[in-house]
Interface confidence: low
């Protein structure tokens, strides 16, 4: 006769492991008992259980409640056992020794491999600001057994670097994603992808990139200078910029206070019916937590009674 078993049994942490051992004997041969033991090199064999043909399953105190026979129907030549709720410490070599008559004893070994799926974590780097050089955007760490694979899925251009730390029964892998921040990266997803044989599918953690910036400021509303004449209604100046975080706007007049009746509504400066009193230099001040910008314009309200042309100067400063 001969023993049938597996070279390797692989389970995920917490699953039940079936340790197979089947004696394929000749006609008339019988199995008296099957003994299961840990057989790791350098350690003495530690018995898990003994399946006796007459007296049933005996379990070592160290494995009480964790070793069972497979559910019926059972073949009397089947010495397989179930190891419940596999933990990392169960990983290693196991030996099944089958005592038969009249053929004698047979033994076989298998290796139990316990996969420990990783629990990845993603840590964003420092605040990203436009104008920085190569900067850490995020790091992703996953620990498991065997070592997991950590990669990145993103449309953003960047560089990755990985390092691994081996522990006694597992390995931790950390991957970092570096980039040169630019405003076009705002809102872009950066996804850490962790692969591992103990996972049914890759684990993904997504981080949304936020890059602080402030665009140059400019003022709209003076494109047609002929519209800025005494009596005109609905005249307005609009300050244009964009940023992350979204900027706030403030209007001032360089050569004095804002004239009465002039309304400030965020990025827009609204004028009452124009008079020559509204002529002057207006400054839009744009700011966010990252930076601030100024843009100033000169308004010259034309009085048709004075036959003089309107001068318009645009100046942008930051």
């Amino acid at each position: 006769g001969e023993l049938e078993t597996s070279d390797v049994v692989t389970v995920v942490l917490g699953q039940d492991a079936k340790l197979p051992c089947f004696y394929r004997g000749d006609s008339g041969e019988q199995v008296g008992q099957v003994a299961w033991a840990r057989a790791d090199a350098g350690e003495g064999a530690q018995e898990l259980a003994l399946l006796h043909s007459k007296y049933g399953l005996h379990v070592s105190p160290a494995y009480e409640g964790r070793v069972e026979q497979p559910p019926p129907p059972r073949n009397p030549l089947d010495g397989s056992v179930l190891l419940r709720n596999a933990v990392q410490a169960d990983e290693g070599e196991y030996e099944c020794r089958v005592s038969t008559f009249p053929a004698g004893s047979f033994q076989a070994r298998l290796r139990l491999r316990v996969l420990v799926p990783p629990l990845p974590s993603l840590n964003p780097g420092p605040a990203l600001e436009e104008g920085q050089g190569l900067t850490l955007a995020a790091s992703c760490t996953a620990e498991g057994s065997p070592a997991p694979s950590v990669t990145w899925d993103t449309e953003v251009k960047g560089t990755t670097s990985s390092r691994s730390f081996k522990h006694s029964r597992s390995a931790a892998v950390t991957s970092e994603f570096h980039l040169v921040p630019s405003r076009s990266m705002n809102g872009q997803p950066l996804t850490c992808v962790v692969s591992h044989p103990g996972l049914l599918q890759d684990q993904r953690i997504t981080h949304i990139l936020h890059v602080s910036f402030l665009a140059e400021a400019s003022v709209r509303g003076l494109e047609d200078q002929n519209l800025w004449h005494v009596g005109r209604e609905g005249a307005m100046l609009k300050c244009l910029s964009e940023g992350q975080p979204p900027p706030s706007y403030n209007w001032t007049r360089l050569d004095g206070p804002l004239p009465s009746g002039v309304r400030v509504d965020g990025d827009t400066l609204g004028f009452p019916p124009l008079t020559t009193e509204h002529s002057g230099i207006y400054v839009c001040h744009v700011s966010n937590e990252f930076s601030s910008r100024d843009s100033q314009v000169t308004v010259d309200v034309l009085d048709p009674q004075e036959d003089s042309g309107k001068q318009v100067d645009l100046v942008s400063a930051s």
Epitope: T5, D7, V8, R111, R113, P146, P197
Partner: nanobody, 118 residues
């Protein structure tokens, strides 16, 4: 480090046969299991069969009775005889070796394409 080189892939009609071979070199003394994996388009890589140094074998249910793995420990080769091929056997086949130091398949061949036409 173990190097693995496969050969023998190709195009075959359904019901036909192919034989894949894999030669190992390098740190062969550390090899424990050797096996064949396959990966079809848009699918996970799966273990087809593996064999121990002593000749104990294991097969995926989908190939039992059709595929046979053999190993020549002296020559450091492992072969896969594939009979009664089906279109669903179409995949890239990879030879793999398991190191007794790491306890998982950590050496891989470059892969060989097997295409089974109906």
């Amino acid at each position: 480090e173990v190097q693995l080189v496969e050969s023998g892939g190709g195009l075959v009609q359904a019901g036909g046969s192919l034989r894949l071979s894999c030669a190992a070199s390098g740190s062969i003394s550390s090899i424990n299991l050797m096996g064949w994996f396959r990966q079809a388009p848009a699918k996970q890589r799966e273990l087809v069969t593996s064999i121990s140094p002593g000749g104990s074998v294991r097969y995926a249910d989908s190939v039992k009775g059709r595929f046979t793995i053999s190993r020549d420990v002296a020559k450091n080769t492992v072969d896969l005889q594939m009979n009664s091929l089906k279109p669903e056997d179409t995949a890239v086949y990879y030879c793999a070796a398991e190191s007794e130091r790491t306890y998982y398949f950590d050496s891989w061949g470059q892969g060989t394409q097997v295409t089974v036409s109906s």
